[in-house]
Amino acid sequence: SGPVKELVGSVGGAVTFPLKSKVKQVDSIVWTFNTTPLVTIQPEGGTIIVTQNRNRERVDFPDGGYSLKLSKLKKNDSGIYYVGIYSSSLQQPSTQEYVLHVYEHLSKPKVTMGLQSNKNGTCVTNLTCCMEHGEEDVIYTWKALGQAANESHNGSILPISWRWGESDMTFICVARNPVSRNFSSPILARKLCEGAADDPDSSMV
């Protein structure tokens, strides 16, 4: 029995739970998901029983091996998977545990602007990047393009300070999770700050 294996999959995709055994006479292999039986295999008997009929089309065994491939992944497939190899030649079953995380492909992140002020010809505000559907395990970074050196900023909130007369800057939010990444629409500093240009001391949401 090895250490817990962490696996990552994407909604609609597939994942393979790797399993090898050098046991000659395997009586049965039992796969469970969150303590619910998933598949029971009897290699000598030649039978494979998928407990829930709706999972039959999603279960496969690449190259006729012991590894289990689960396809058409859904968010609620995330959880703990456990396999036991039972054999009369083993005093106790050989076991392996897996943790599967299923992530959605990220949609375009949404950017909102915080309170904006314009003092002494400098536009100051915060840009906040977020996912509309509250996806999990999302990491945000910002790219600021247009200065002599392009800059990166980690985190969902980007503080901006842009002086009128400077060359225009473009801000892009990059949202990432373990299976995908997506980009916000580019935001131009000049356009962002135009609303506050007339009144040097104004604030707007």
Epitope: K22, E44, G45, G46, T47, I48, F61, G65, Y66
Partner: antibody, heavy 120, light 108 residues
Framework: QVQLVQSGAEVKKPGASVKVSCKAS????????MNWVRQAPGQCLEWIGR????????KYNGKFKGKATLTADKSTSTAYMELSSLRSEDTAVYYC?????????????WGQGTLVTVSS | DIQMTQSPSSLSASVGDRVTITCKAS??????VAWYQQKPGKAPKLLIY???YRYTGVPDRFTGSGSGTDFTLTISSLQPEDFATYYC??????????FGCGTKVEIK
């Protein structure tokens, strides 16, 4: 990739013996069952038996007990089938075939076949 | 020994046709049936095992079904490369494993 390469065609006289070899590569030879299957002209496929190279354990079709002897050499990843007391009815193409792990009676990789002709 | 009776022994079909081959076991073999394709002068090739599990790389136009004593191999839309002989085989529990005598799929 998995490959099973068999020895060449043989012509034998009735009463003689023949030994066919099957050299495996591309997988763990010792831990998969190796089957032997024959296909006589105009006849159905017939399962002869199988061997587990890891320990030499064999299982035979009763029809071929005393006719076929299966052995394996782990050091060269080669399986052998010896046929004794050959008769004209033993004229056939003989195949070695690896068992899948998930269903040990299903055979996923096959050798190219060895034609054994028994003729006086 | 368990007998596997395959039908028909041969059939003629055209490209694009749906083809069904059946196999009947002389006793209950649960879902332990495999299907193979063989072309002249070549070794058999595994298509389906455990009645309905498509082997890796086998096109999804090949579907296996059945349990107990009655089994079916269906080719949903026959392709030029599918003209061949097809064999069923029971791989249930203790050997000997036994094969059907084949169905030759020919061009109409």
């Amino acid at each position: 990739q998995v490959q099973l390469v068999q020895s060449g065609a043989e012509v034998k006289k009735p009463g003689a013996s023949v030994k066919v070899s099957c050299k495996a590569s591309g997988y763990a030879f010792s831990s998969s069952w190796m089957n032997w299957v024959r296909q006589a002209p105009g006849q159905c496929l017939e399962w002869i038996g199988r061997i587990y190279p890891g320990d030499g354990d064999t299982k035979y079709n009763g029809k071929f007990k005393g006719k076929a002897t299966l052995t394996a050499d782990k050091s060269t990843s080669t399986a052998y089938m010896e046929l004794s007391s050959l008769r004209s009815e033993d004229t056939a193409v003989y195949y070695c075939a690896r068992s899948t792990m998930i269903a040990t009676g299903a055979m996923d990789y096959w050798g190219q076949g060895t034609l054994v002709t028994v003729s006086s | 020994d368990i007998q596997m009776t395959q039908s028909p022994s041969s059939l003629s079909a055209s490209v694009g046709d749906r083809v069904t081959i059946t196999c009947k076991a002389s006793q209950d073999v649960s879902t332990a049936v495999a299907w193979y394709q063989q072309k002249p002068g070549k070794a058999p090739k595994l298509l389906i095992y455990s009645a309905s599990y498509r082997y890796t790389g086998v096109p999804d136009r090949f579907t296996g079904s059945g349990s107990g004593t009655d089994f079916t191999l269906t080719i949903s839309s026959l392709q030029p490369e599918d003209f061949a002989t097809y064999y069923c085989q029971q791989h249930y529990s203790t050997p000997p494993y036994t094969f059907g005598c084949g169905t030759k799929v020919e061009i109409k």
